[in-house]
C-alpha cells in the first residue's frame, strides 16, 4: 500500500480560472464560482434547471452564513424556517408554523398560545383589574337629596387586557341600592322638576288649608308641643337604626 507514486488523475476542470468576476476566487464556465474571495459566502443559485455558484457578501433569505477557516457558504435554514440566525435558531417561520425559542412548531406548547399576527408562541395573558374605587355617594337621578332610596356605584380599571386564551375581564362597575335619611334639597340643589313638585305640593296644601281652616287637624302638623317634638325625634331615631340594620343585610349589587 505504501507506494512511492500517487495515482495520476486528469484535472477535473481544465477551464478553472483565477481571473473571475463578482467575488469568485476560482470559477469555471460551466459551474460559475467554485470558491469565493475572503469573507464572501458561496451559494448555489438556481437558474432554471441549472445551479450556478455565486459569491455574496451576505446570504439570501432562507439561508444563514457558515464560516469555516477560509471557506464560507450559505447554508439552508431548516425546512420549516424562513429566516434563521444559524442551523438551530430560527427568527421567522414559514407559513403555518409558530416561532418558539428559535424553533418552528405547528402548534404551541402547553401554557402558550399562538399569536396569528406575529406567528409566535406567546405566554397566555390573563386579565388584570385594579382594586375597586370607594362607593360613590348615594344618589338618585344625579342628586344626593330629595329621596329616601337611591343607588351607589363603584368602579375599577382594566390594567391588563387578556390574550385570546386568557381569563376574561371581570365587570368594571358595580351598583347597589342604598337607603338614606330623607334630606330636603337646598335651593341650589333643587332641579326644575323639584321646584315644580314643590309648587304643586304647596298649592295642594293651600287648597287643603282653605277648605278646612276651621278644622284643628290642619293646624296639628305645624304646631307641636315640646313633648310631641321629643316623641317624634325618638321615633325617627328608631326608624333610622332599623334602616341602617336593613341596609347592612340587604345590599343589592347590580353588575353592569
Amino acid at each position: 500500500q505504501n507506494a512511492s507514486r500517487g495515482r495520476r488523475q486528469r484535472r477535473m476542470h481544465p477551464n478553472v480560472s483565477q481571473g473571475c468576476q463578482g467575488g469568485c476566487a476560482t470559477c469555471s464556465d460551466y459551474n460559475g464560482c467554485l470558491s469565493c474571495k475572503p469573507r464572501l459566502f458561496f451559494v448555489l443559485e438556481r437558474i432554471g434547471m441549472k445551479q450556478i455558484g455565486v459569491c455574496l457578501s451576505s446570504c439570501p433569505s432562507g439561508y444563514y452564513g457558515t464560516r469555516y477557516p477560509d471557506i464560507n457558504k450559505c447554508t439552508k435554514c431548516k425546512v420549516d424556517c424562513d429566516t434563521c440566525f444559524n442551523k438551530n435558531f430560527c427568527t421567522k417561520c414559514k407559513s403555518g408554523f409558530y416561532l418558539h425559542l428559535g424553533k418552528c412548531l405547528d402548534s404551541c406548547p402547553e401554557g402558550l398560545e399562538a399569536n396569528n399576527h406575529t406567528m409566535e408562541c406567546v405566554s397566555i395573558v390573563h386579565c388584570e383589574a385594579s382594586e375597586w374605587s370607594p362607593w360613590s355617594p348615594c344618589m338618585k337621578k344625579g342628586k344626593t337629596c330629595g329621596f329616601k332610596r337611591g343607588t351607589e356605584t363603584r368602579v375599577r380599571d382594566i390594567l391588563q387586557h387578556p390574550s385570546a386564551k386568557g381569563n376574561l375581564c371581570p365587570p368594571t362597575s358595580e351598583t347597589r341600592t342604598c337607603i338614606v335619611q330623607r334630606k330636603k334639597c337646598s335651593k341650589g340643589e333643587r332641579g326644575k322638576k323639584g321646584r315644580e313638585r314643590k309648587r304643586k305640593k304647596l298649592n295642594k296644601e293651600e287648597r287643603k288649608e282653605t277648605s278646612s281652616s276651621s278644622d284643628s287637624k290642619g293646624l296639628e302638623s305645624s304646631i307641636e308641643t315640646p313633648d310631641q317634638q321629643e316623641n317624634k325625634e325618638r321615633q325617627q331615631q328608631q326608624k333610622r337604626r332599623a334602616r341602617d340594620k336593613q341596609q347592612k343585610s340587604v345590599s343589592v349589587s347590580t353588575v353592569h
Epitope: 488523475q9 476560482t26 470559477c27 459551474n31 425546512v79
Partner: antibody, heavy 119, light 107 residues
Framework: EVQLVESGPGLVKPSETLSLTCTVS????????WNWIRQPPGKGLEWIGY???????YQNPSLKSRVTISRDTSKNQFSLKLSSVTAADTAVYYC?????????????WGQGTLVTVSS | DIQMTQSPSSLSASVGDRVTITCKAS??????LSWFQQKPGKAPKTLIY???RLVDGVPSRFSGSGSGTDYTLTISSLQPEDFATYYC?????????FGQGTKVEIK
C-alpha cells in the same frame, strides 16, 4: 496533472503519535483545501480535517483534540499528526483535495498508506 | 453532525441491470452531495458532485438525482468494471460525513 503521495511509517505503537506527509505536485498548496481522510480495514471512510490555502485548519470534532495538520509551502507538502493512537486508529490514510463548493469534492486523491497501530 | 444513511449495504446485480443506490441525510443538505466509487486496494474516485454533475471522464450511464434529504445514484446499465463499493458524501457543513457504502457484487 495533480498528484498526491502519502508517506510515513506503516507501524505505530499504541499511545504514540502517528505522523504522515502528503507531497503535492501539479498544483500549489497555497490554493485549494488539502484534506486527510482515513478508512479502517473493511470499513467506511472518515474525514479527518483540512488545511486551507492560507494555512488555516479545521478538524473533525470527533478527533480534534488529537489531530494536528500543518504544512511546508517550500516543499509543497502538508502533514498529519495523530497523538495517543490506539488499535482503533489502524486504517488506510488518504490525502485529497478540493477547490471549493462549486467543484468536485476530493477530485484528487493520494494512493493511500496503511498505518497499523500495534505493539 | 449530519448522518448519511446509505442503502442497500450490498446488492447483487448482473451486467446490463439498472442499479439504484440511495443516500438519506439526517437533514436538508441542499444538493451538496458527491458519489464515489472505490475498488479493492484503490483510492476512491469521484463520480458525481453537487448531486447530479458528472465529473469529466465518468461514463454517462452514471447519474445522480435528489434534493433536500434524499439522494440517488443510478447506473443505467451495469458494466463489468462497475462492480465496486459506492459511497455518498455530504459537504453541506463540517464535519463532512460519508455514507456507510454499498457493495455492488456480481449476481
Amino acid at each position: 496533472e495533480v498528484q498526491l503521495v502519502e508517506s510515513g511509517p506503516g507501524l505505530v505503537k499504541p499511545s504514540e503519535t502517528l505522523s504522515l506527509t502528503c507531497t503535492v505536485s501539479g498544483d500549489s498548496i497555497t490554493s485549494g483545501y488539502w484534506n486527510w481522510i482515513r478508512q479502517p480495514p473493511g470499513k467506511g471512510l472518515e474525514w479527518i480535517g483540512y488545511i486551507s490555502y492560507s494555512g488555516k485548519t479545521y478538524q473533525n470534532p470527533s478527533l480534534k483534540s488529537r489531530v494536528t495538520i500543518s504544512r511546508d509551502t517550500s516543499k509543497n507538502q502538508f502533514s498529519l499528526k495523530l497523538s495517543s493512537v490506539t488499535a482503533a486508529d489502524t486504517a488506510v490514510y488518504y490525502c485529497a483535495t478540493y477547490y471549493g463548493y462549486g467543484g468536485p469534492w476530493f477530485a484528487y486523491w493520494g494512493q493511500g498508506t496503511l498505518v497499523t497501530v500495534s505493539s | 453532525d449530519i448522518q448519511m444513511t446509505q442503502s442497500p449495504s450490498s446488492l447483487s446485480a448482473s451486467v446490463g441491470d439498472r442499479v439504484t443506490i440511495t443516500c438519506k441525510a439526517s437533514q436538508d443538505i441542499d444538493s451538496y452531495l458527491s458519489w464515489f466509487q472505490q475498488k479493492p486496494g484503490k483510492a476512491p474516485k469521484t463520480l458525481i458532485y453537487l448531486t447530479n454533475r458528472l465529473v469529466d471522464g465518468v461514463p454517462s450511464r452514471f447519474s445522480g438525482s435528489g434534493s433536500g434529504t434524499d439522494y440517488t445514484l443510478t447506473i443505467s446499465s451495469l458494466q463489468p468494471e462497475d462492480f465496486a463499493t459506492y459511497y455518498c458524501l455530504h459537504y453541506d457543513e463540517f464535519p463532512l460525513t460519508f455514507g456507510q457504502g454499498t457493495k455492488v457484487e456480481i449476481k
